[in-house]
């Protein structure tokens, strides 16, 4: 994200009366983790538990339907991206616990954080793709009937993954392990060194393609979808509005700190006080962004429960209703009453 993505305690406590035992790898000031790091660890732990279980369940539910149901393709890809992101969390967790020391080697430094980034961007871009699909379903139903197929859905997913890969390449190329002399510590991060312009370019492209564009897509698509469904009394639902607002708002809220700090740090000198302050908040911003990886299954379940009236079905059954039903008027992660009624009938018939 930044010039060199790490934080450590400051070592400004030396004076003639205070000479440390310097046999220990890290000095006594670093025995306690910073508050932002503690918060990040808590978030990582929760996201890992909810994300792994929730997304694994979504993958299991959608995998069987993905060959014939387009919605299942969307949610399968989204869940795979989120699931893979969550699997990398123990690595980040371990590093933060060790005061950002990276004991996993150079290859792991290049690959693991880059994989995390790949999966996180894939989930964002897939979300944007899904919203575009919902938009077309509502406003171009005839076109959808003719051209909207599983093949096209898989191509769209491949494009999303490809773009995510492109966004990740700079991070992979510039990622290095640095062993600091004192206090002895190995750090993993991106180092643009001589290329501040490229660092800024990467940050701007990442902001636009990985945040502003998907956000714009989500906002425009869902605004139009809401206006259309709102204008038809039969499909009006405050729950629909709430779910749609939840999708867009969660995306915006959880990614905003990461993107804002990222763009700011690319324009700041690494030795400046603002940079150092933002660097201390880096783990917290990353953990905040990671909430996106576990929020989707929660929204699905809440949406499914809300519209079923009460939880009469098992969780997999509920998720199957929410994720795999094909309809022409249903928005991504938002379900009108009429649609859910149809889904319930079809599920009972299976």
């Amino acid at each position: 994200m930044n010039s060199f993505n790490y934080t450590t305690p400051d070592y400004g406590h030396y004076d003639d009366k205070d000479t440390l035992d310097l046999n220990t790898p890290v000095d006594k000031t670093s025995n306690t983790l910073r508050v932002p790091d503690i918060l990040a660890l808590v978030i990582f732990a929760v996201v890992f538990l909810v994300g792994v279980l929730g997304n694994a369940l979504v993958v299991w539910v959608t995998a069987f339907e993905a060959k014939r149901t387009i919605n299942a393709i969307w949610f399968l890809n989204l869940a795979v991206a989120d699931f893979l992101s969550c699997l990398a969390l123990p690595i980040l967790f371990t590093s933060i616990v060790q005061h950002h020391h990276w004991p996993f080697g150079g290859a792991a430094c290049s690959i693991l954080p880059s994989l995390i980034l790949l999966n996180m961007y894939a989930s964002i871009l897939l979300l944007a793709t899904i919203s575009a699909d919902r938009f077309l379903l509502v406003f171009k139903p005839i076109w959808c009937q003719n051209f909207r197929g599983a093949g096209l859905a898989w191509i769209a997913c491949a494009v999303a993954w490809g773009l995510a890969l492109l966004l990740t390449i700079p991070s992979f190329l510039y990622r290095v392990v640095r062993e600091e002399y004192f206090p002895p510590k190995v750090l993993c991060g991106v180092d643009y060194s001589h290329d501040k312009r490229r660092e800024r370019a990467v940050a701007i492209v990442r902001l636009v393609l990985g945040f502003l564009w998907p956000l714009l897509t989500l906002t425009i698509c869902y605004t139009f979808i809401l206006l259309r469904t709102w204008s038809r009394r039969a499909t009006r639902s405050t729950k629909t509005l709430k779910v749609v607002v939840a999708v867009v708002a969660s995306f915006f809220i959880f990614w905003l700190p990461y993107q804002v700090t990222g763009i700011m740090m690319s324009f700041l000198e690494p030795s400046s006080p603002t940079f150092l302050l933002l660097n201390k908040l880096d783990s917290l911003c990353v953990s905040f962004a990671y909430i996106n990886c576990c929020i989707n299954p929660i929204i699905y379940v809440v949406a499914g429960q809300g519209f079923q009236g009460r939880l009469r079905k098992s969780l997999p059954s509920l998720l199957r209703n929410v994720l795999t039903e094909e309809s022409v008027v249903r928005e991504s992660k938002s379900f009108t009453r009429s649609t859910v009624d149809t889904m319930a009938q079809k599920t009972q018939a299976v």
Epitope: L22, N23, E180, Y181, P184, N279
Partner: antibody, heavy 125, light 112 residues
Framework: QVQLQQSGAELAKPGASVKLSCKTS????????MHWIKQRPGLGLEWIGY????????KHNQKFKDKATLTADRSSSTAYMQLSSLTYEDSAVYYC??????????????????WGQGTTLTVSS | DVVMTQTPLSLPVSLGDHASISCRSS???????????LHWYLQRPGQSPKLLIH???NRFSGVPDRFSGSGSGTDFTLKISRVEAEDVGIYFC?????????FGSGTKLELK
Amino acid sequence: QVQLQQSGAELAKPGASVKLSCKTSGYTFTNYWMHWIKQRPGLGLEWIGYINPSGDYTKHNQKFKDKATLTADRSSSTAYMQLSSLTYEDSAVYYCARVPLSYGSGNGPYYFDYWGQGTTLTVSS
Amino acid sequence: DVVMTQTPLSLPVSLGDHASISCRSSQSLVHSNGNTYLHWYLQRPGQSPKLLIHKVSNRFSGVPDRFSGSGSGTDFTLKISRVEAEDVGIYFCSQSTLVPLTFGSGTKLELK
């Protein structure tokens, strides 16, 4: 005042070992790390490693990991570097240099404030 | 390893002239604590190196104020405002941010 007095010039044969010394005075020996630096004509300065005399913790440049052994004798306030399996490439001037731990905010043992006068090692058959 | 590239290799000057030596590192020398551990040493003929400047721009005790250091990240400069006879020798830049600690190849300051 602070002094780092190094042992005299050494002449050794290839394959042999030598032990260079750096006797300190004028400061508390255990409060400062001692570094060793190699200088060959036309090849600049090379960092070998350091020892923390208070607990004999050492850190080496990987390049010298199997070449140099760093030790310290707290009773005589002397640091030692033993060079083993000598080759012609080991012919150089070797310096000991100390690093301060007490120069104010944001500082640690980062720069060499005092150097020894150097020991010339000649490896020749 | 961090490669320290010094320019020029040789710098012939006249007494009272200004002199400038450049040092560039292959990686950023900004430590995770925000400090930059780039130092300058002078090795006079037949002597051991002496510290001139530490942490980019801080003069060591006893160093005349005609010596000044500047720079950030990867690019650093040592300036001598009015060269005196005692300034002759080899100037080394050195980094102690990352392991292994490394030195520049040296710049030989000599009188014309």
